[in-house]
């Protein structure tokens, strides 16, 4: 049976086997087409989600679709039901928490009172001044907290206590990519991880350990990527994996936070990378132990210079490494998180591509997660 499962797929009505390589090849090989059902699916960027959270204390902002202007949500008459609606608009199903925070001196958006209309937040028509003088600080999910804070050094062995959101994404029990837990159902990774194998069946996620072989595998229900754009072939290197069963969070299995929409990190901002990838550029093998390293944001202009990536790094990517080189992600780290710590840990990047590993002028290039928040929210909403 194991051999059959490894090399063949069983079609129903009438029952017969087809070679596994015919799964997800774009041809209907089973009479009912089930060989093309459980495949990596693409999902468009979709419409603008009309709510967002700012890095200014996770304050809620609402879009006026008529004018295209954004407004900050006033705390006056804001309720748990409105908080749930806001989070549902972003695709969250968990119970949110919210609190009042004082309107700051740098508040640049108009502040309006919020109401609800057909399960979407709206601005109250006759909105007067914000009497409470407070904004809504909203958290849709408890995230980005670990049991242990890493020390700032070069490269060292990591503990799952520090990075409880890190997962190993495996095909046929072989580690292919890293990934990050975003909520009980969803794992964030890179789209290029699925280039070779587009059938969902054989992909598994392993969570809760820093050692590659030692933890149970979780079944995957769906793998979703963005529609391919030939004008920007290296953009959109992002994928969401929906797990068949929700994760139970613990000290070693927890979600990382998504970045805020306005999370602009300046050059030299310290960041962290983790993974089980190659420790040498051309070989060796995967590391059995999770490794961690501190890096920093590298200016896109520098990264696009003639001796570096020559303009290939787009607005939806970011570079990170250390100026002198030597610390970088490598093959096998793909899909894993590039992380920034403020109050919580945020996944600001996804390990995507680069020329070599650790070269001084060619640092790692990462998918900029904040550029894809809209897509993530639209996927989640479609799957609620």
């Amino acid at each position: 049976k194991v051999i059959l499962d490894k090399y063949y797929f069983l079609c129903g009505q009438p029952l017969h086997f087809i070679p596994r390589k015919q799964l997800c090849d774009g041809e209907l090989d089973c009479p009912l087409g089930e060989d093309e059902e459980h495949c990596v699916k693409s999902f468009p960027e979709g419409p603008a989600v009309a709510v967002r959270l700012s890095k200014d204390r996770s304050t809620l902002q609402v879009l006026d679709s008529a004018t295209g202007n954004w407004f900050s949500a006033c705390f006056d008459n804001f309720t748990e039901a409105l908080a749930e609606t806001a989070c549902r608009q972003m695709g969250y199903s968990s119970k949110p928490t919210f609190r009042a925070v004082e309107i700051g001196p740098d508040q640049d958006l108009d502040v309006v009172e919020i109401t609800e209309n057909s399960q979407e937040l709206r601005m109250r028509n006759s909105s007067g001044p914000c009497l409470s003088g407070s904004l809504v600080s909203l958290h849709c999910l408890a995230c980005g907290k670990s049991l242990k804070t890493p020390r700032v050094v070069g490269v060292e062995e990591a503990s799952v206590d520090s990075w409880p959101w890190q997962v190993s994404i495996q095909y046929d029990k072989q580690h292919v990519c890293g990934g990050s837990i975003l909520d009980p159902h969803w794992v964030l990774t890179a789209a290029h991880c699925f280039r070779k194998h587009t059938d969902v069946f054989n992909w598994k996620v392993r969570a809760g350990s820093d050692k590659l072989g030692s933890f149970p595998s979780l079944a995957v229900a769906k793998i979703i990527i963005i529609e391919f754009n030939p004008m920007y072939p290296k953009d959109n290197d992002i994928a969401l994996m929906k797990l068949q069963f929700p994760l139970t969070f613990s000290g070693t299995v927890r979600p990382i936070c998504l970045p805020f929409f306005d999370e602009e990190l300046t050059p030299a901002t310290p960041l962290w990378i983790i993974g089980w990838g190659f420790t040498k550029q051309n070989g060796g093998k995967m590391s059995d132990i999770l490794l961690q390293a501190s890096v920093q944001v590298i200016d896109s202009t520098r990264c696009n210079a003639d001796d570096a990536y020559q303009g290939e790094v787009t607005e939806k990517m970011m570079c990170a490494g250390i100026p002198e080189g030597g610390v970088d992600t490598c093959q096998g780290d793909s899909g894993g998180p590039l992380m920034y710590q403020s109050d919580q840990w945020h996944v600001v990047g996804i390990v995507s591509w680069g020329y070599g590993c650790g070269g001084p002028s060619t640092p790692g290039v990462y998918t900029k997660v904040s550029a894809y928040l809209n897509w993530i929210y639209n996927v989640w909403k479609a799957e609620l």
Epitope: P230, M231, Y232, E312, T314, E315
Partner: antibody
Framework: QVQLVQSGAEVKKPGASVKVSCKAS????????MHWVRQAPGQGLEWMGW????????GYAQKFQGRVTMTRDTSTSTVYMELSSLRSEDTAVYYC?????????WGQGTLVTVSS | DIQMTQSPSSLSASVGDRVTITCRAS??????LNWYQQKPGKAPKLLIY???RLQSGVPSRFSGSGSGTDFTLTISSLQPEDFATYYC?????????FGPGTKVDIK
């Protein structure tokens, strides 16, 4: 510096095929998609399709599906565009181009004239 | 496919004039809009990418604005070498499509 050098002008009869070449230099050939765009005399620009020189994968505009084939020779860093079943309305200048944010480079163009 | 329209289709202007060309997409393309300049017998040249970002080496008299469906290319002070045809192009989704062009000639 990046250069895309195309083959010379061609005159073809209706029903025939034409194969235009585009030789790339000054960058890593397999790292960038190549696109083909055409422009009929006095008309606008029309995108035909793309090729990934690394994998050989291609994508064609619906209008040209079944008539266009894009291939590459990595040993010479050359991409080819072949258009078959030519008709008079295929008379145009054909450009190869490396497109994308900030990465815009075009060949000098190849005039293909289809005439009986 | 996303349709792109441009207006005007042609315009006559003098050196030093401020020139504005508009481009409209049949659906929202966010800021995935490029502007090209083409002179007779030459390949197109990229001026502006992502609606408002100036391509390296392009004079600062060229600027772009807009997002969603409506976009504008502005030449603040027309120079003799700017007489050409200008095309907008969306790169939001495949296939990339071009506007029909705006010819700018000497008054």
């Amino acid at each position: 510096q990046v250069q895309l050098v195309q083959s010379g002008a061609e005159v073809k009869k209706p029903g025939a095929s034409v194969k235009v070449s585009c030789k790339a230099s000054g960058y890593s050939f397999t790292s960038h998609y190549m696109h083909w765009v055409r422009q009929a005399p006095g008309q606008g620009l029309e995108w035909m399709g793309w090729m990934n020189p690394n994998s050989g994968n291609t994508g064609y505009a619906q209008k040209f599906q079944g008539r266009v084939t894009m291939t590459r020779d990595t040993s010479t860093s050359t991409v080819y565009m072949e258009l078959s079943s030519l008709r008079s309305e295929d008379t145009a200048v054909y450009y190869c181009a490396r497109l994308g944010q900030q990465l815009d480079y075009w060949g000098q163009g190849t005039l293909v004239t289809v005439s009986s | 496919d996303i349709q792109m329209t441009q207006s005007p289709s042609s315009l006559s202007a003098s050196v030093g004039d401020r020139v504005t060309i508009t481009c409209r997409a049949s659906q929202s393309i966010r800021n995935y809009l490029n502007w090209y300049q083409q002179k007779p017998g030459k390949a197109p040249k990229l001026l502006i990418y992502e609606a408002s970002r100036l391509q390296s080496g392009v004079p600062s008299r060229f600027s772009g604005s807009g997002s969603g469906t409506d976009f504008t290319l502005t030449i603040s002070s027309l120079q003799p070498e700017d007489f050409a045809t200008y095309y907008c192009q969306q790169s939001y989704s495949a296939p990339p499509t071009f506007g029909p062009g705006t010819k700018v000639d000497i008054k």
